[in-house]
């Protein structure tokens, strides 16, 4: 048995790590193999976390973690039975995936103004709280040409748009996902969409 | 509410033994390292021992080392710290501390008096 | 004699800022990551800073931690006759295999 992908970890910042590999054949992740991490911190225990299965021979364990500071220096560990397959190291703060914002609503009754606000996936005690930004997807279902993307550069987890901007009467579809750049972070997953139907008072023609 | 309640301290001669308890509660105590600090009269702090979450490691300071030992009963949610050989210099207010990368939580403290 | 050095004493008058450093020796290492807490007249220390600059929750964004090399420094903006009491810094040393502690700052709001 032999790891023929080396283990990739990103970290949400808070309380998870997910670390990735894949095996040189088909594997029972979860009864063949674990992998002990541990915080590089003189009182710190190495912890277990047992895989699951990603595909055939693909590996994902989700490594709880207490909370994760920019010093965070984690040593993991990757058995199958008493043989050591991969030994590493990762450094949360240096793989960081945000969480995915989430209740996202379109508020559709401020005239002929669109909000859409979310909540950004963060207590205000950690640190990305206050360094996240956004992009929006707004999609058509009735035309896939018609796809758009907003960036939210700002703090405030809210887009307003003139609802003219987009067609009347038609549904539109609408998600959010984040990202920090004070750590470099990848894109968060997109948020679940929500949808509504755009409609608005189409201003009189002036002739 | 994390609360750690120190008891056990008292006036004992020279060359005497002492047992500190620390009762835990408001947290998982299983799941954290903890540690004891003390402070001399008029003094600063100084650490004198951490004993991490299962018991497996245990550190102290050159000072105690030989004469003190730290133990914990996660059953019970309680820290120990075992003083044996005592001398004047062992003077001091006893925090029991949780920690978390720091010493996080702290107790009010108990007061060993090491005199003849 | 602490491997970490402060200075015994600091002031200043309401409002204003004061830092307090926090030194290691040279053959110090510069791996760890430092702490500072506050100790109250007649009370037991609390944390202030961890992991260098980060606050517990419940601590005012007045007090701010910085770290270069081997030494770290405690700042207090904004300043208040509550702030009046004894700092340490503190770190983890690997080699000594245990926990060292500055010996301590009194800081004294005029």
């Known amino acids: 048995m032999k790891v023929l992908q080396e283990p990739t970890c990103v970290s949400d910042y808070m309380s998870i790590s997910t670390c990735e590999w894949k095996m040189n054949g088909p594997t029972n992740c979860s009864t063949e193999l674990r992998l002990l991490y541990q915080l590089v911190f003189l009182l710190s225990e190495a912890h277990t976390c047992i895989p699951e299965n990603n595909g055939g021979a693909g590996c994902v364990c989700h490594l709880l973690m207490d909370d994760v500071v920019s010093a965070d220096n984690y040593t993991l560990d990757l058995w199958a039975g008493q043989q050591l397959l991969w030994k590493g190291s990762f450094k949360p703060s240096e793989h960081v995936k945000p969480r995915a914002p989430g209740n996202l609503t379109v508020h559709t009754n401020v005239s002929d103004t669109l909000l859409l606000t979310w909540s950004n996936p963060y207590p205000p005690d950690n640190y990305l709280y206050n360094h996240l930004t956004y992009a929006v997807n707004i999609w058509s279902e009735n035309d896939p040409a018609d796809f758009r993307i907003y960036n939210v550069t700002y703090l405030e987890p809210s887009l307003r748009i003139a609802a003219s901007t987009l067609k009347s009467g038609i549904s539109y579809r609408a998600r959010v996902r984040a990202w920090a750049q004070c750590y470099n972070t990848t894109w968060s997953e997109w948020s679940p969409s929500t949808k509504w139907h755009n409609s608005y008072r189409e201003p009189f023609e002036q002739h | 509410e994390v609360q750690l309640l120190e008891s056990g301290g008292g006036l004992v001669q020279p060359g005497g033994s002492l047992r500190l308890s620390c009762a835990a509660s408001?947290?998982?105590?299983?799941?954290?390292?903890m540690a004891w600090v003390r402070q001399a009269p008029g003094k600063g702090l100084e650490w004198v021992s951490a004993i991490t979450s299962s018991g497996r490691s245990i550190y102290y300071a050159d000072s105690v080392k030989g004469r003190f030992t730290i133990s914990r009963d996660n059953s019970k949610n309680t820290l120990y710290l075992q003083m044996n050989s005592l001398r004047a210099e062992d003077t001091a207010v006893y925090y029991c501390?949780?920690?978390?990368?720091?010493?996080?939580?702290w107790g009010q403290g108990t007061l060993v008096t090491v005199s003849s | 004699q602490s491997v970490l050095t402060q200075p015994p004493s600091a002031s200043g008058t309401p409002g204003q800022r004061v830092t307090i450093s926090c030194s290691g020796s040279p053959l110090f290492p510069d791996s760890g990551s430092f702490n500072w807490y506050q100790q109250l007249p007649g009370t037991a220390p609390k944390l202030l800073i961890y992991a260098d600059s980060h606050r517990p929750s419940g601590v005012p964004d007045r007090f701010s931690g910085s770290k270069s090399g081997t030494s770290a420094s405690l700042a207090i903006s904004g300043l208040r006759s509550e702030d009046e009491a004894d700092y340490y810094c503190g770190t983890w040393d690997y080699s000594l295999s245990g926990y060292v502690l500055g010996g301590g700052t009194k800081l004294t709001v005029l």
């Open positions: 501390a949780r920690v978390h990368r720091a010493f996080d939580y």
């Open positions: 408001g947290f998982t105590f299983s799941r954290h390292a």
